[in-house]
């Protein structure tokens, strides 16, 4: 997963103008994640729910198969929250030698893959160290930015432990983009 | 304050047209809150500034007793941010004992009160363990994300703590919304 | 830097129309910083890539000398991300004195100076207490809300420690902003 | 230096209101909220509220709650209080104290204003 | 409600130690902006000597210095001088926003 380097200037294929109310916008929230096995150090994408409860897809904004995919060249507000649970992490255990643990760590990194250029580019990653000394921690890595984007691009969010992803509730984790 | 699961598609009522110019949109800031009892497993609502400072409401945007009120049915995006404060909390005391004790925690919850529904809607969570060894610890949690929200909706900010919130400043503790 | 107390109501100045494609936005991404001497308990201004990779400048918003210059008189939504790193805190050493060390902090402001007002002000602030006890740390601070800018108002990004920002990717640090 | 001066004692009829005012000094007034304080003859300190002099926001304990009203006049730095309704266990010193934003301690004090409720 | 309780009253000779504690009877006590001691000598306003449970102000002497363990928060006093007779308040806020003061203590130095 590289980062795009060269991903230059406005858009020129964008129409003439679309009215807020008829803009692509999505909103999608997280669901219990099928398991699908993936290389230790890999980034797993999670999938998402489009349609039930505060989730949805407007104005030609489509999801499909983990990804969103834009249907309008433009510049998109992106988001996302990953709210992340865990039991007591390695290095929590405060032990008396010299070298302390390296720590663990969570990360989430929204994915965009073009038809245009080859490799998937990180548009945004939010990575923490998590050194926890209680039995039980839970936290939030929230991600939002503004890029240009081309008809066509879809859009994924990967997490470093898919079995550490909140997928219980609606409002704790989530994914979501408009036409600004 | 259990959330809604089937809150459907795209709102009827929408005028044709609205320009970015006369969009409903507020910017409230956190204000000193008074003093007022409430249960302890509650979630409690915050208060706020909604014309000193940084803080306006504009295009009959309205904000009324701790609620940011819809005027216009349409896709809105929704943000907050608290920062909690506080002094060492519990979990922070490395006992010897085998089993660590249960972490602290804060949270934020945004919440929708709508006409149509009965029950208050959890829009956005963000919820954290707090198991801090410092004698003061502080940090904010974010939240922002797109909903459809009708006309007459009610958006208020929830906290699981209300005495470890940071009042001091407007730039630290805030929620808004915009229509998109 | 105090924070502006009265900052009054909706700019005056805005243009009639400005449909969507044609307002002011940028995606500022973080590069290597040079090393530039400061006051130690004064924040450090970040600079910015404005134009490789992932970042750009639209509609007049320009970039200069660590500013995004507003062009254009109305509300914007403005964002940043900052990732920072360091190895264990001080207040990380669990000693057995009776009195806890003073935590490590990482303070981001997103600071507006204007023509106007003699005073930069403080728009947005995530501060955050760090202490770690594993040997390396790294967390993310996010920030986003709407603010009314009159034209020539210019915005700048600091932080408590400019050598704890990683600077290695695009897509950890950014800085952002577009009329809503 | 930072210096709060209240008014002078009161002797005041159970019933009647009683207004004590505060005057700051050696820094910007509205920067900081200001806290009431009382203490009856003999007795411990008990809190009765503060007031924000920029926005002119309030909050008072639940105990004095519409019976007191805290204001402030800008043009001139001076914080007032207000008890109404007196009754003979209101007699007390009254300090106004200036908060910390971040800890919310007194950090500085009046030299008080002793309020005598007597018929 | 909420209750801060202190112990009447305590005494020691000139130059020994004396600590008196700060009881709550809530957790949420001092949880976000902890607990803060005053100094009350005879006929004079109260005067800040701890805030936050261990920070003394400017102008404070190091003799005095404060602690926490669990519910509880203390106040020592090292090197007793007979000046440091007079009563001494914790205080803190609990969770419904209102100032707490405890009962006082009063120094007796013999």
């Known amino acids: 997963f590289p980062t795009v380097t060269e991903e230059r200037s406005a858009p020129s294929a964008q129409p003439v103008y679309t009215p807020s109310r008829d803009k692509p916008k999505a909103h999608l929230t997280i669901m219990r994640q099928t398991p699908v096995p993936h290389l230790k150090n890999e980034l797993a994408a999670l999938h998402w729910e489009n349609n039930l409860g505060m989730a949805f897809t407007k104005n030609r904004m489509n999801y499909t198969n983990k990804f969103l995919v834009i249907p309008e060249s433009g510049d998109y507000f992106i988001y996302s929250q990953i709210t992340f649970r865990g039991t007591t992490s390695e290095c929590g255990d405060i032990s008396r030698v010299r070298r302390p643990k390296k720590p663990d760590s969570i990360t989430v990194v929204i994915t965009k893959v073009a038809d245009s250029y080859p490799e998937p580019a990180h548009l945004l990653t939010g990575t923490k160290s998590v050194c926890e000394i209680s039995s039980n921690w839970f936290q939030p890595i929230y991600l939002g930015a503004m890029f240009s984007l081309e008809e066509g691009d879809r859009l994924m969010v990967n997490v470093s432990d898919i079995s550490l992803v909140d997928y219980t509730k609606e409002d704790k984790t989530f994914f979501g983009a408009f036409l600004i | 304050f259990p959330t809604v699961t089937e809150e459907r598609s795209a709102p009827s009522a929408q005028p044709v047209y609205t320009p970015s110019r006369d969009k409903p949109k507020a910017h409230l800031t956190i204000m000193r809150q008074t003093p007022v009892p409430h249960l302890k497993n509650e979630l409690a609502a915050l208060h706020w500034e909604n014309n000193l400072g940084m803080a306006f409401t504009k295009n009959r945007m309205n904000y009324t007793n701790k609620f940011l009120v819809i005027p216009e049915s349409g896709d809105y995006f929704i943000y907050s941010q608290i920062t909690f404060r506080g002094t060492t909390s519990e979990c922070g005391d490395i006992s010897r004992v085998r089993r660590p004790k249960k972490p602290d925690s804060i949270t934020v919850v945004i919440t929708k009160v709508a006409d149509s529904y009965p029950e208050p809607a959890h829009l956005l969570t963000g919820t954290k363990s707090v198991c801090e060894i410092s004698s003061n610890w502080f940090q904010p949690i974010y939240l922002g994300a797109m909903f459809s929200l009708e006309e007459g909706d009610r958006l208020m900010v929830n906290v699981s703590d209300i005495s470890l919130v940071d009042y001091t400043k407007e730039d630290k503790t805030f929620f808004g919304a915009f229509l998109i | 830097f105090p924070t502006v107390t009265e900052e009054r109501s909706a700019p005056s100045a805005q243009p009639v129309y400005t449909p969507s494609r044609d307002k002011p936005k940028a995606h500022l991404t973080i590069m290597r910083q040079t090393p530039v001497p400061h006051l130690k308990n004064e924040l450090a201004a970040l600079h910015w890539e404005n134009n490789l990779g992932m970042a750009f400048t639209k509609n007049r918003m320009n970039y200069t000398n660590k500013f995004l210059v507003i062009p254009e008189s109305g509300d914007y939504f403005i964002y940043s991300q900052i990732t920072f790193r360091g190895t264990t805190s001080e207040c990380g050493d669990i000693s057995r004195v009776r009195r806890p060390k003073k935590p490590d902090s990482i303070t981001v402001v997103i600071t507006k100076v204007a023509d106007s007002y003699p005073e930069p002000a403080h728009l947005l602030t995530g501060t955050k207490s760090v202490c770690e006890i594993s040997s390396n740390w790294f967390q993310p601070i996010y920030l986003g809300a709407m603010f009314s800018l009159e034209e020539g108002d210019r915005l700048m990004v600091n932080v408590s420690d400019i050598s704890l920002v990683d600077y290695t990717k695009e897509d950890k640090t950014f800085f952002g902003a577009f009329l809503i | 230096q930072v210096q709060l001066v209240q008014s002078g004692a009161e002797v005041k009829k159970p019933g009647a209101s009683v207004k004590v005012s505060c005057k700051a000094s050696?820094?910007?007034?509205?920067?900081?909220?200001i806290n009431w304080v009382r203490q009856a003859p003999g007795q411990g300190l008990e809190w009765m509220g503060w007031?924000?002099?920029?926005?002119?926001?309030?909050g008072y304990a639940q105990k004095f709650q519409g019976r007191v009203t805290m204001t402030a006049d800008r043009s001139t730095s001076t914080a007032y209080m207000e008890l109404s309704s007196l009754r003979s266990e209101d007699t007390a010193v009254y300090y106004c104290?200036?908060?910390?934003?971040?800890?919310?301690?007194?950090?500085?004090w009046g030299q008080g204003t002793l309020v005598t409720v007597s018929s | 409600q909420s209750v801060l309780t202190q112990p009447p009253s305590v005494s020691g000779a000139p130059g020994q130690r004396v600590t008196i504690s700060c009881t709550s009877s809530?957790?949420?006590?001092?949880?976000?902006?902890?607990v803060h001691w005053y100094q009350q000598l005879p006929g004079t306003a109260p005067k800040l000597l701890i805030e936050g449970y261990y920070n003394r102000p400017s102008g404070v002497p190091d003799r005095f210095s404060g602690s926490k363990s669990g519910t509880s928060a203390s106040l020592t006093i090292t090197g007793l001088l007979p000046e440091d007779e007079g009563d001494y308040y914790c205080q803190s806020w609990d969770g419904t926003l209102s100032a707490l003061f405890g009962g006082g203590t009063k120094l007796t130095v013999l």
């Open positions: 050696g820094y910007t007034f509205t920067s900081y909220d």
């Open positions: 007031l924000n002099p920029n926005s002119g926001y309030t």
């Open positions: 809530s957790s949420d006590i001092g949880a976000g902006l902890g």
């Open positions: 104290a200036r908060e910390v934003p971040e800890t919310a301690a007194f950090e500085y």
